[in-house]
């Protein structure tokens, strides 16, 4: 039975040209995290394998940095980066947990962070 929950940074906004940390946290389960995939819509941004470490997709290598932790840092943001991001936790023995983050990249210098929320 899957008992875990994923806490994410929720709906967030950031300035064009700036950077942002996408963060998810899996709690309420003793399952072992074997791999975390970060995806934007249908595109794979990065993989963090528990044993083998990080793989950043070549098309994002210049603008995506691993961490902190299992999170992902997006740099040199453009308005095209606006959209949904997913952290997909592959665990043993529970299975897969998915968290969703919506990022809005703003032209203005006012970029407020949204509240944290939980996805069961």
């Amino acid at each position: 039975m899957m008992t875990g929950t994923i806490e994410t940074t929720g709906n967030i906004s950031a300035e064009k040209g700036g950077s942002i940390i996408l963060q998810c946290h899996l709690s309420s389960t003793t399952a072992q995290v074997t791999q975390v995939n970060w995806e934007q819509q249908d595109q794979l941004l990065a993989i963090c394998n528990a044993d083998l470490g990080w793989h950043i997709s070549p098309s994002f290598k210049d603008r995506v940095a691993p961490g902190p932790g299992l999170g992902l840092t997006l740099q040199s943001l453009t308005v095209n980066d606006t959209g949904e991001y997913f952290c997909i936790y592959h665990t043993y023995p529970d299975g897969t947990y998915t968290g969703r983050i919506f990022l809005e990249v703003l032209e203005s210098s006012v970029a407020e962070h949204g509240a944290r929320f939980q996805i069961p």
Epitope: T34, Q35, N37, D42, L44, I47, N49, D51, L52, G53, H55, H90, T96
Partner: antibody, heavy 123, light 107 residues
């Protein structure tokens, strides 16, 4: 041309260990991860794990953790797979297979395979 | 782990006919899917990667399609050397997993 040459067939008793070797040639050994796959008689293919020949880092399937050890010797371009506490269900052909992509474990299908090593576990 | 299911288990086809093999993933693997061919007593041979791209030297009669959870390998006109077992495999989530295989036999 890329070649993966594996060690010869082995017959082992239950409880023993076996160490299978896979010698690579025809490419830069440390640039490609190596996977191990096994196939029991008349059965399908089963993923066992992977090793990064450059760093020595490994990732094993949960089923084999605690029983399998994958190592490499960069001086001879050889990877090894050792399986301990053998039981009759471990009777299978063991294959090493190279991951296609250079310098990463993704996205990497298995492009070259060794000829296989038959391991028979019998009392 | 991601479970890969192949169907049918056995496919009986006459030489020159078309063969269609299916592979289903228990969750999306995007296009991170490979197909392999294995003949008796031999190691698997890589045919297709990225769900639809033929490996070097693979004849054009082999084609792959699909994305997400549903995939197909089509052999447009079966030659005598194509009778073998075919396996699909996902390579997005460890442990990488194979389907149970489809045996293509002579009708």
């Amino acid at each position: 041309q890329v070649q993966l040459v594996q060690s010869g067939a082995e017959v082992k008793k239950p409880g023993a260990s076996v160490k299978v070797s896979c010698k690579a040639s025809g490419y830069t050994f440390t640039s490609h991860y190596m996977g191990w796959v096994r196939q029991a008689p008349g059965q399908g293919l089963e993923w066992m794990g992977i090793i990064n020949p450059s760093m020595g880092a490994t990732s094993y399937t949960q089923k084999f953790r605690g029983r399998v050890t994958m190592t490499r010797d960069t001086s001879t371009s050889t990877v090894y797979m050792e399986l301990s506490s053998l039981r009759s269900e471990d009777t299978a052909v063991y294959y090493c297979a190279r991951l296609h992509v250079s310098g990463s474990y993704y996205p990497a299908y298995l492009d070259y395979w060794g000829q296989g090593t038959m391991v028979t576990v019998s009392s | 782990e991601i479970v890969m299911t192949q169907s049918p288990a056995t496919l009986s086809v006459s030489p020159g006919e078309r063969a269609t093999l299916s592979c289903r993933a228990s969750q999306s693997v995007s296009s991170n899917l490979a197909w392999y061919q294995q003949k008796p007593g031999q190691a698997p041979r890589h045919l297709i990667y990225g769900a639809s791209t033929r490996a070097t030297g693979i004849p054009a009669r082999f084609s792959g399609s699909g994305s997400g959870t549903e995939f197909t390998l089509t052999i447009s006109s079966l030659q005598s050397e194509d009778f073998a077992v075919y396996y699909c495999q996902q390579y997005i989530v460890f442990p990488w997993t194979f389907g149970g295989g489809t045996k293509v036999e002579i009708k």
